[in-house]
Interface confidence: low
């Protein structure tokens, strides 16, 4: 899917837009809000009834190079006694983010935007049960 | 920036780090993944820490539509379907990268922007502070 131009019948392109070759776009990778920090409750990955672990994936040809992925620790959920209850399910919650991929073709370098699906954490759900007729 | 191994046969002019500004192909790789969480799963309703999804729409951003989760309850839903306030529903937040039109309203000029989104909720045991 191409990044949409501003899809409005009334829209006038500002005069100040930089010239861009056809089929490509100019991307400044100096991140706005670079120093913003997540302010989640402490250790929720361990305190959750559907706890998870984090794994850092590293790819030098991706920007950002580091992407953190969560994995649910259990198939079931942790009950009040601290035991796994398999009548409930721990399931991953996912979110898309954008990354920039650097591609090498011979000595030339090109850049491609890529959607990456990140597993953010896990939640405990009641399972869907399909009854056999 | 990030360091990359370079083909030894190539001229040595390329910076090891990503340049500050790059020209990017307009087509997005992996573009067909489902962006609407309501369509991709019903976890938001089936969770013991259910959440509502709020639509945030901004044509100056790509993707222009982002869904934000808000936990429905302070507590969690127990086996009887009631809210148990001995447990807490808390949002799971994630920093994601989006594109911001820069200068504003330009069709093919963007800057990466980091935004914080609440993706869903999870049920946690509360932190209890005992008074000495």
């Amino acid at each position: 899917r191409k990044i949409p131009k501003v899809g409005h019948t009334f829209f006038q392109k500002p005069e100040s837009c930089p010239p861009v070759p056809g089929g490509s776009m100019k991307l400044d990778i100096g991140i706005i809000n670079e120093n913003q920090r997540v302010s989640m409750s402490r250790n929720i990955e361990s305190r959750s009834t559907s706890p998870w672990n984090y794994t850092v994936t590293w790819d030098p040809n991706r920007y950002p190079s580091e992407v953190v992925q969560a994995q649910c620790r259990n198939l079931g959920c942790i009950n009040a006694q601290g035991k796994e209850d398999i009548s409930m399910n721990s399931v991953p919650i996912q979110q898309e983010t954008l990354v920039v991929r650097r591609k090498h073709q011979g000595c030339s370098v090109s850049f491609q935007l890529e959607k990456v699906l990140v597993t953010v954490g896990c939640t405990c759900v009641t399972p869907v049960i399909h009854h056999v007729q | 920036g990030i360091t990359i191994p370079r083909n030894p046969g190539c001229p040595n002019s390329e910076d090891k780090n990503f340049p500050r500004t790059v020209m990017v192909n307009l087509n997005i790789h992996n573009r067909n993944t489902n962006t609407n969480p309501k369509r991709s799963s019903d976890y938001y309703n089936r969770s013991t820490s259910p959440w509502n999804l709020h639509r945030n729409e901004d044509p100056e951003r790509y993707p222009s539509v982002i869904w934000e989760a808000k936990c429905r309850h302070l507590g969690c839903i127990n086996a009887d379907g009631n809210v148990d306030y001995h447990m807490n529903s808390v949002p799971i937040q994630q920093e994601i990268l989006v594109l911001r039109r820069e200068p504003p309203h330009c069709p093919n000029s963007f800057r990466l922007e980091k935004i914080l989104v609440s993706v869903g909720c999870t049920c946690v045991t509360p932190i209890v502070h005992h008074v000495a």
Epitope: G7, H8, F10 | N36, R39, R55, E57, P59, E68
Partner: antibody
Framework: EVQLLESGGGVVQPGRSLRLSCAAS????????MHWVRQAPGKGLEWVAV????????YYADSVKGRFTISRDNSKNTLYLEMNSLRPEDTAVYYC?????????????????WGQGTTVTVSS | QSVLTQPPSASGTPGQTVSISCSGS????????VDWYQQVPGAAPKLLMY???YRPSGVPDRFSGSQSGTSASLAISGLQSEDEADYYC???????????FGSGTKVTVLG
């Protein structure tokens, strides 16, 4: 020329049903989100419902939730509003309106094209 | 009772500037762009301003809009007799999960 033409209004008794239609022309109907907005006599504008370009998402005002259904037939370039369990307070001119930008937008560019409206009177 | 509050009326003489305010909350104006509509008696509403302060083609530059925090405003400079109409602000509301209109402001051109 971009046009929206509502029809189906009339006088109806409380508790009865009515179906409004909105015929679209002059633009690619299947690319745009669509709204219904109403205006009671001598009163302000009240939003009723919105439907996404492909019909997959629908939202309603609390005052009509569970009674009204918004739908669309992209092959016929037509928007519908099915109104059940009508009440006297539903008496109004009903307008259909097009979202100003194509694709997955509901509101960022406003409602740029409006029909002339169709009058619904709920009275015994 | 609308969640977006507007003054019921505003007036001015030809050539004057009239401002209309629209006050909301964090769940609507605080998060989403505001649109403005003009409705002359007996006609359908017309989009006057979108995305806080952008004019559709055909709308004179005498109309300007701004938005900050949880409020927005519409200014009409060089007021003309044809500006006599009802004006509505509108935006999306996250709490109500829907589009909401302001209560409306009737602008009267005096003299």
């Amino acid at each position: 020329e971009v046009q929206l033409l509502e029809s189906g209004g009339g006088v109806v008794q409380p508790g009865r049903s009515l179906r409004l239609s909105c015929a679209a022309s002059g633009f690619i109907f299947s690319n745009y989100g669509m709204h219904w907005v109403r205006q009671a006599p001598g009163k302000g504008l009240e939003w009723v419902a919105v439907i996404s370009y492909d019909g997959s998402n629908k939202y309603y005002a609390d005052s009509v939730k569970g009674r009204f259904t918004i739908s669309r037939d992209n092959s016929k370039n037509t928007l519908y509003l099915e109104m059940n369990s009508l009440r006297p307070e539903d008496t109004a001119v009903y307008y259909c309106a097009k979202v100003g930008a194509s694709g997955d937008y509901y509101y960022s560019y406003g409602l740029d094209v409006w029909g002339q409206g169709t009058t619904v009177t709920v009275s015994s | 009772q609308s969640v977006l509050t507007q003054p019921p009326s505003a007036s001015g003489t030809p050539g004057q500037t009239v401002s209309i305010s629209c006050s909301g909350s964090h769940s609507n104006i605080g998060r989403h762009p505001v649109d403005w509509y003009q409705q002359v008696p007996g006609a359908a509403p017309k989009l006057l301003m979108y995305y806080g302060g952008y004019r559709p083609s055909g709308v004179p530059d005498r109309f300007s809009g701004s938005q900050s925090g949880t409020s927005a405003s519409l200014a009409i400079s060089g007021l003309q007799s044809e500006d006599e109409a009802d004006y509505y602000c509108a935006t999306w509301d996250d709490r109500l999960v829907g589009y909401v209109f302001g209560s409306g402001t009737k602008v009267t051109v005096l003299g």
